[in-house]
Interface confidence: low
């Protein structure tokens, strides 16, 4: 008896680790037996070379290799998300749609967010070696090595928090070279080696007056960028504070600042910067589009006074200061696929909320633009005739669209049987190459 399709085996989320193909399973019942088709991010897969997807007779989808979406080794942001796959089973009585399964790729970037630094600690006192592991998917775990061997963590003496190593009481035997190692299924990364020297405590008397100092951080003002710093300066702020208590016991003041985490989240470690001032000073090297917490700490020699109150400052977002990278145009079945990689993280200048894609005039596409919202880094454009297709892509933050990529073009021949990419080893054409060919 005839029956509509029903999904029996749904595809499952998985991590693409290679080198072999990734498999997505889908099994369905129904009479007549249903035909299976797969969709990626809601778009049907063509299964026609050079599409890396291949459909097996039992409905299983093979992904022979992940699309070229950037390289973990080039230090650029990499989209780990290859997309959400769904399968559809259809016969003349209807269609059944599976649950979506996300395929993502294991990535571990090279660049540590914070590298451990050489430091001098005092016997009996605590010290911290900072380490911000590189961004990775899945999130990397952090281990510490000392003098080339894994560090045996002693409860109560060693604590690893957010990657940083906290030593409760320094001992002479803690002297040595430390390295932070980040590991996930994509591999591992080693930080720079940091030299830790341990000194015996010196006889000194801590100025008691310093403990009586109260600092009130009164203002944190965003400074107007200095034109001499070029067109894309990092933001700087002006801190001003008031000191009350004993007469000028502090020899210096240090700014402590960090990006504000979401409420309830564990606070980021405080960065420290010696300030060139006794009541106010400039602090630079911040990032646009971030919320910062600031406080000031007085010190005199090795003695430190109590921290000031905390002030918050929301640095406005700016447009991204670099274009999306690795923009590619590929022919599809009656469509052109545009894909790209986000700009480098240091050029985001806020949260990238999406991308703007322009087609350029004087080609087969009339001048038009599309908005891609969210983290998606690809776009499918319908094409109705052979000819040249040229696009530019720009990343968008809350402040607007940033610098566009340089135009990338693709020449589609009659009936879109094949795409002319001349010279083939150079991939998609630039606008200049295309114009030269059309003149010929």
């Amino acid at each position: 008896q005839d029956s509509p399709p029903q999904i029996l085996v749904h595809p499952q989320d998985q991590l693409f680790q290679g080198p072999g193909p990734a498999r997505m399973s889908c099994q369905a019942s129904g009479q007549p037996p249903p035909t299976i088709r797969w969709l990626l991010n809601g778009q049907p897969l063509s299964m026609v070379p050079p599409d890396p997807h291949h459909l097996l007779p039992d409905g299983t989808l093979l992904l022979l290799q992940p699309p070229a979406r950037g390289h973990a080794h080039d230090g650029q942001a990499l989209s780990t998300d290859l997309g959400v796959y769904t399968c559809e089973a259809s016969n003349r009585l209807g269609t059944a749609v599976s649950r979506g399964a996300r395929l993502s790729v294991a990535v571990l970037r090279e660049d540590f967010q914070i590298q451990p630094r050489d430091m001098v600690a005092v016997v009996g006192e605590q010290f911290t070696l900072e380490c911000g592991p590189p961004w990775g998917h899945p999130e990397p775990t952090v281990s510490w090595w000392k003098d080339g061997k894994p560090l045996a963590l002693q409860p109560g003496r060693h604590t690893v928090s957010g990657g940083s190593l906290l030593m409760a009481r320094a001992e002479k035997s803690d002297e040595g070279t430390y390295m932070c190692v980040a590991t996930n299924s994509a591999g591992h990364r080693e930080s720079r080696a940091a030299r830790v020297s341990i000194q015996e405590p010196q006889d000194y008397t801590e100025p008691v007056e310093l403990l009586a100092v109260r600092i009130q951080l009164e203002n944190v003002t965003l400074l107007n960028p200095d034109p001499a710093e070029g067109p894309k300066p990092r933001p700087a702020v002006w801190l001003s504070w008031k000191v009350s208590g004993p007469a000028a016991p502090a020899q210096s003041y240090t700014a402590l600042f960090r990006t504000q985490t979401a409420p309830g989240g564990q606070g980021a470690p405080w960065a420290e910067e010696l300030l060139a001032g006794w009541q106010s000073a400039e602090l630079g090297g911040l990032h646009w589009g971030q919320d910062y917490e600031f406080k000031v700490r007085p010190s005199s020699g090795r003695a430190r006074g109590p921290d000031s109150n905390v002030l918050l400052l929301r640095l406005p977002e700016k447009v991204p200061s670099a274009p999306p990278q690795e923009v590619t145009l590929k022919p599809g079945n009656g469509t052109v696929f545009v894909s790209w990689v986000p700009p480098p993280a240091e050029n985001h200048n806020g949260i990238i909320r999406g991308y703007q894609v322009w087609s350029l005039g004087n080609t087969s596409l009339p001048p038009a633009n599309w908005t891609v919202v969210g983290e998606q880094t690809q776009l499918e454009i319908a094409t109705h005739m052979p000819g040249s297709y040229c696009v530019q892509v720009a990343a968008v933050t809350g402040a607007g669209a940033g610098e566009p990529s340089r135009p990338v073009c693709l020449l589609l021949e009659q009936a879109m049987e094949r795409a002319t990419q001349e010279p083939s080893e150079h991939g998609p054409w630039t606008l200049e190459q295309l114009r030269a060919t059309l003149k010929r």
Partner: antibody
């Protein structure tokens, strides 16, 4: 001397509209976050929303989102609270208040100057 | 939104008493807490900001402490003018929230 003065309160029917003003003196509102806070009769304080005139930044409590709009006229050094589709539960004394600090961004965990408040009564 | 729970909701005390009011946040708010005093028919007045910093012009008998989720306002020696309602407020999130208030009455 720093001062905030609210005005524009009164009796309005449910579904009606009202615009409150918060006139500032002794400082320019452009560099500060100005918040609106309300207090229903015999009840506690409830945050309504804020504006940061220099950046045009605004945000609202969920209870008023879509009905209330905060704006500012920096030439008049005044912030406004436009209240539409008023309900009986919006009946309260409305205060405007200034966040401590003079900087780009909300800051410093405290509202140091408050207006005297203006009473809004929503009743048929 | 982050909830701020104050206790007690009211208390009776005498002049010279030491009074402690507590405030608990529903999640970590760092030191983003302020305390206000409000008298009937008047606007709130800022006493403490950043959890422990005395606002200028506020008598030193008022003090604040705490970080994370638990905060305390202490009046070391209650004066006649201190009988009022006290509110805590967090500004760790974009949507500030207030405690429900603690009324300090004369015993």
């Amino acid at each position: 001397e720093v001062q905030l003065v609210e005005s524009g309160g009164g009796l309005v029917q449910p579904g009606g509209s009202l615009r409150l003003s918060c006139a500032a003196s002794g400082f320019t509102i452009n560099g500060y976050y100005i918040h609106w806070v309300r207090q229903a009769p015999g009840k506690g304080l409830e945050w309504v929303g804020f504006i940061y005139p220099a950046g045009g930044d605004t945000d609202y409590a969920d209870s008023v989102k879509g009905r209330f709009t905060i704006s500012a006229d920096t030439s008049k050094n005044t912030a406004y609270l436009q209240m539409n589709s008023l309900r009986a539960e919006d009946t309260a004394v409305y205060y405007c208040a200034r966040l401590i600090g003079n900087k780009f961004g909300w800051s410093s965990y405290g509202m140091d100057y408050w207006g005297q408040g203006t009473l809004v009564t929503v009743s048929s | 939104d982050i909830q701020m729970t104050q206790s007690p909701s009211s208390l009776s005390a005498s002049v010279g008493d030491r009074v402690t009011i507590t405030c608990r946040a529903s999640q970590d708010v760092s030191t983003a807490v302020a305390w206000y005093q409000q008298k009937p028919g008047k606007a709130p007045k800022l006493l403490i900001y950043s959890a422990s910093f005395l606002y200028s012009g506020v008598p030193s008998r008022f003090s604040g402490s705490g970080s994370g989720t638990d905060f305390t306002l202490t009046i070391s020696s209650l004066q006649p003018e201190d009988f009022a309602t006290y509110y805590c407020q967090q500004s760790r999130s974009d949507h500030p929230t207030f405690g429900q208030g603690t009324k300090v009455e004369i015993k």
